[in-house]
């Protein structure tokens, strides 16, 4: 017999076909010899089936000898034998039904558990195969889980479902609740305006929820809550703020906030969370902010970085337009009894400046200039 | 897999440019500092200088100031190192090298490439 | 700039035995901001580009069998082959990438006696 695989919620079409290219008198089946449908003449008749008001035809089909019967909203519980009566001839075609459900919610905050659930007749035993919207294939029964979800597993998950040598394929769409990105630094210098922005990799119609930054100075023992906000329908509000530093927050999407001046005691890490209505746990982006002071005292020359910077980077003091006077994996150099001119303190990755600060070296009778 | 291809050996004379090649593949071109470092016959190695391929800054040894120029080709993924007013002394081997991820020490480098300079 | 000094300049050491090699900086190249020393330890076979197998003065590099080892901190230096295998025969250099500019050892050649 024929086997032919449907999904939950869609509309199937089982063919019967006559030897005779005219309409003629057939009856559609289930296993349990219960009339579905069939035809009186050009009347489309009714059995007394559970598929009732589901359950039509293709008259227009009916005068090349093609008697379909179609079931639409499939569910599971329509996985049967189906029996088309014509000509004296039974044609049998088996149905099969399967679901493919997303165990919560499609929209999932990230590090969370995504499973899919694979609802299927008694008696049959599909394999599952999925591919997710970066190309990672996982296979399973029944369920597949996949834990801990990123950012790039948000989009088109397609799924295809195996069984008797046929397939068919559920398309789902998953959003993966997130800010762009889970990390970013900040290079600044003492005394400049300093701009944190948290941009979110996802857009819906409505946000609501509240958030908080939790700042950890490098210079301090413990962490501190430096702003709390809400979040009604992608409107932010400020709930509470510290005296010092005191920081603005803008009132719209993308959240954004400003610290007034970049300051030594300030660079260090944060992290900011935002907690959504209806959704269990939190998102999270980690922001770093690094300042950079160039000094003059007396004959001393220094340069220094505060905050969480690589091993990697290389901190420079050199005169404009000459070779670097110091060159050092440190987070202060100094230059002794420096020549006058402007000099120029370089913190940079494999040659990329990623902060400059600049100090004018006048002659030993003058006091220093900072531009 | 990760590797830095080199272009081929080259003769030149005295006063003249060379521009040797390097490209890269197996690994993401933008995230890793290229120094370049060279090695004449029978001597040690000699570091010249290093270029960030995601902005293409530079960083040059004080010795080659002024006669190196170090350049990249992203869409390549290929950097290049030109030396000009060449002189006998600067026959050697040049070699590129990737910085580590987490250090800068030299993980991966160049198959190198023999430059002649002879009148 | 910083002096890197090997010694030996060559060294003979029988198959199985232990091979020491020095490394001297003419400054120290321990961060005192990040707590690291910036030294490294490569190998180089004839006709071959230089191989990394120690950063970080003691953290070998991907790899590298664990006969090899760094050790030494500030401006003193060592790498150790505890038991000498026939491939090992090469010139070994220290290098410091503390400062630039990046500076290497004049080498070490190691053979077998």
């Known amino acids: 017999k024929k086997v032919v695989l449907g999904k939950k919620g869609d509309t199937v079409e089982l063919t019967c076909t006559a030897s005779q290219k005219k309409s003629i008198q057939f009856h559609w089946k289930n296993s349990n010899q219960i009339k579905i449908l069939g035809n009186q003449g050009s009347f489309l008749t009714k059995g007394p089936s559970k598929l009732n008001d589901r359950a039509d035809s293709r008259r227009s089909l009916w005068d090349q000898g093609n008697f379909p019967l179609i079931i639409k909203n499939l569910k599971i519980e329509d996985s049967d034998t189906y029996i088309c009566e014509v000509e004296d001839q039974k044609e049998e075609v088996q149905l099969l039904v399967f679901g493919l459900t997303a165990n919560s919610d499609t929209h999932l905050l990230q590090g969370q558990s995504l499973t899919l659930t694979l609802e299927s007749p008694p008696g049959s035993s599909p394999s599952v195969q999925c591919r997710s919207p970066r190309g990672k294939n996982i296979q399973g029964g029944k369920t597949l889980s996949v834990s801990q979800l990123e950012l790039q597993d948000s989009g088109t998950w397609t799924c295809t479902v195996l069984q008797n040598q046929k397939k068919v394929e559920f398309k789902i769409d998953i959003v993966v609740l997130a800010f762009q990105k889970a990390s970013s630094i900040v290079y600044k210098k003492e005394g400049e305006q300093v701009e944190f922005s948290f941009p979110l990799a996802f857009t819906v119609e409505k946000l609501t929820g509240s958030g908080e930054l939790w700042w950890q100075a490098e210079r301090a023992s413990s962490s501190k809550s430096w702003i709390t906000f809400d979040l009604k329908n992608k409107e932010v509000s400020v709930k509470r703020v510290t005296q010092d530093p005191k920081l603005q927050m803008g009132k719209k999407l993308p959240l954004h906030l400003t610290l007034p001046q970049a300051l030594p005691q300030y660079a260090g890490s944060g992290n900011l969370t935002l907690a959504l209505e209806a959704k269990t746990g939190k998102l999270h982006q980690e922001v770093n902010l690094v300042v950079m002071r160039a000094t003059q005292l007396q004959k001393n020359l220094t340069c220094e970085v505060w905050g969480p910077t690589s091993p990697k980077l290389m901190l420079s003091l050199k005169l404009e337009n000459k070779e670097a006077k110091v060159s050092k994996r440190e987070k202060a150099v100094w230059v002794l009894n420096p020549e006058a001119g402007m000099w120029q303190c370089l913190l940079s990755d494999s040659g990329q400046v990623l902060l400059e600060s600049n100090i004018k070296v006048l002659p030993t009778w003058s006091t220093p200039v900072q531009p | 897999q990760v590797q830095l291809v080199q272009s081929g050996a080259e003769v030149k004379k005295p006063g003249a440019s060379v521009k040797v090649s390097c490209k890269a593949s197996?690994?993401?071109?933008?995230?890793?500092?290229i120094s370049w470092v060279r090695q004449a016959p029978g001597q040690g190695l000699e570091w010249m200088g290093i270029i960030n391929p995601s902005g293409g800054s530079t960083s040059y040894a004080q010795k080659f100031q002024g006669r190196v120029t170090m350049t990249r080709d992203t869409s390549t993924s290929t950097v290049y190192m030109e030396l000009s007013s060449l002189r006998s002394e600067d026959t050697a081997v040049y070699y590129c090298?990737?910085?580590?991820?987490?250090?800068?020490?030299?993980?991966?480098w160049g198959q190198g490439t023999m430059v002649t300079v002879s009148s | 700039d910083i002096v890197m000094t090997q010694s030996p300049d060559s060294l003979a050491v029988s198959l199985g035995e232990r091979a020491t090699i020095n490394c001297k900086s003419s400054?120290?190249?321990?961060?005192?901001?990040?707590?690291?020393?910036?030294l490294a330890w490569y190998q180089q076979k004839p006709g071959q580009p230089p191989k990394l197998l120690i950063y970080?003065?003691?953290t070998r590099a991907s790899g590298v069998p664990d006969r090899f080892s760094g050790s030494g901190s500030g401006t003193d230096f060592t790498l150790t082959i505890s038991s000498l295998q026939a491939e090992d025969v090469a010139v070994y250099y220290c290098?410091?990438?503390?400062?630039?500019?990046?500076?290497f050892g004049q080498g070490t050649k190691l053979e077998i006696k």
């Open positions: 090298a990737r910085e580590g991820r987490s250090h800068d020490a030299f993980d991966i």
């Open positions: 197996g690994f993401t071109f933008t995230d890793y500092g």
């Open positions: 290098q410091q990438y503390y400062s630039t500019p990046f500076t």
């Open positions: 400054q120290s190249v321990l961060s005192s901001s990040y707590n690291k020393n910036y």
């Open positions: 970080w003065a003691s």
